[in-house]
């Protein structure tokens, strides 16, 4: 499980690998703060509601964010 309440940052392990945008329930981008010095990206999957931490520095994850924002802009009027 990549999440923990016992450390200041939410993510313990992060993945460089993208996921299929269509399988995402939610994508949270948590900015760096006094509690955690790095940006964290948490993907909640539609299947089983599983949460995954994604590496914001990974090119593949940046591509995923681009794809998701493009999808959102298509949907919004």
């Amino acid at each position: 499980v990549p999440l923990s309440r016992t450390v200041r940052c939410t993510c313990i392990s992060i993945s460089n690998q993208p996921v299929n945008p269509r399988s995402l329930e939610k994508l949270e981008i948590i900015p760096a703060s006094q509690f955690c010095p790095r940006v964290e990206i948490i993907a909640t999957m539609k299947k089983k509601g599983e949460k995954r931490c994604l590496n914001p520095e990974s090119k593949a994850i940046k591509n995923l964010l681009k794809a998701v924002s493009k999808e959102r802009s298509k949907r919004s009027p």
């Epitope: 460089n16 993208p18 996921v19 299929n20 520095e57 090119k59 994850i61 591509n63 794809a67």
Partner: antibody, heavy 119, light 107 residues
Framework: EVQLVQSGAEVKKPGATVKISCKVS????????MHWVRQAPGKGLKWMGW????????TYADDFKGRFTFTLDTSTSTAYMELSSLRSEDTAVYYC????????????WGQGTTVTVSS | DIQMTQSPSSLSASVGDRVTITCKAD??????IAWYQQKPGKAPKLLLH???TLQPGIPSRFSGSGSGRDYTFTISSLQPEDIATYYC?????????FGQGTKLEIK
């Protein structure tokens, strides 16, 4: 040494199913996504999609939705590509390619598997 | 999907010639282009990524440049072993696309 070793050439009849394997060595299998690329005889390279090796979740390019299935066996560090209801136009060389996700490009390729569909 | 238009589709040159291949994307790909060499019966081999970064072990006669939508791959002095087909790949999107390829022959 990082290696992707694919299964041997296949000759199949139209309507049959083929399953190609891509066994990796020299790195941790679940650290990199695995992509598949098709090359028809005398033609260029066409990206087919990828599988997330941590979750097993496949993603298919639009032209490769329906008859194509990407799967994994993480215990043997092997990726598979299965193609059903074979047609003559599926005759091609199929490559697996590791994506160096952090930077985003394909850095290591399998040697290719030739699939020939002929009645 | 991002479309990549590669030209020329074939090219004949002499040993020692400077050879240039171009790829044009239909939108800005932010320098996220790689170049591959494929010899007959072999898998593609990565030469350059991020427009101009040479892979370890690749001779310095291979180079790349460009930005925005327009990219160039150059062999400064063609060698007999460079006879192959060359492909560009854009990876600025989750949906990858290759150029159509350029077949390079010796005159």
């Amino acid at each position: 040494e990082v290696q992707l070793v694919q299964s041997g050439a296949e000759v199949k009849k139209p309507g049959a199913t083929v399953k190609i394997s891509c066994k990796v060595s020299g790195y941790t299998f679940t650290d990199y996504s695995m992509h598949w690329v098709r090359q028809a005889p005398g033609k260029g390279l066409k990206w087919m999609g990828w599988i997330n090796t941590e979750t097993g979740e496949p993603t298919y390019a639009d032209d490769f939705k329906g008859r194509f299935t990407f799967t994994l066996d993480t215990s043997t560090s092997t990726a598979y590509m299965e193609l059903s209801s074979l047609r003559s136009e599926d005759t091609a060389v199929y490559y697996c390619a590791r994506n160096y996700d952090y930077d985003g490009y394909f850095d290591v390729w399998g040697q290719g598997t030739t699939v020939t569909v002929s009645s | 999907d991002i479309q990549m238009t590669q030209s020329p589709s074939s090219l004949s040159a002499s040993v020692g010639d400077r050879v240039t291949i171009t790829c044009k994307a239909d939108q800005d790909i932010n320098k996220y282009i790689a170049w591959y060499q494929q010899k007959p019966g072999k898998a593609p081999k990565l030469l350059l990524h991020h427009t101009s970064t040479l892979q370890p072990g690749i001779p310095s006669r291979f180079s790349g440049s460009g930005s925005g939508r327009d990219y160039t791959f150059t062999i400064s002095s063609l060698q007999p072993e460079d006879i192959a087909t060359y492909y560009c790949l854009q990876y600025d999107s989750l949906l990858f696309t290759f150029g159509q390829g350029t077949k390079l022959e010796i005159k």
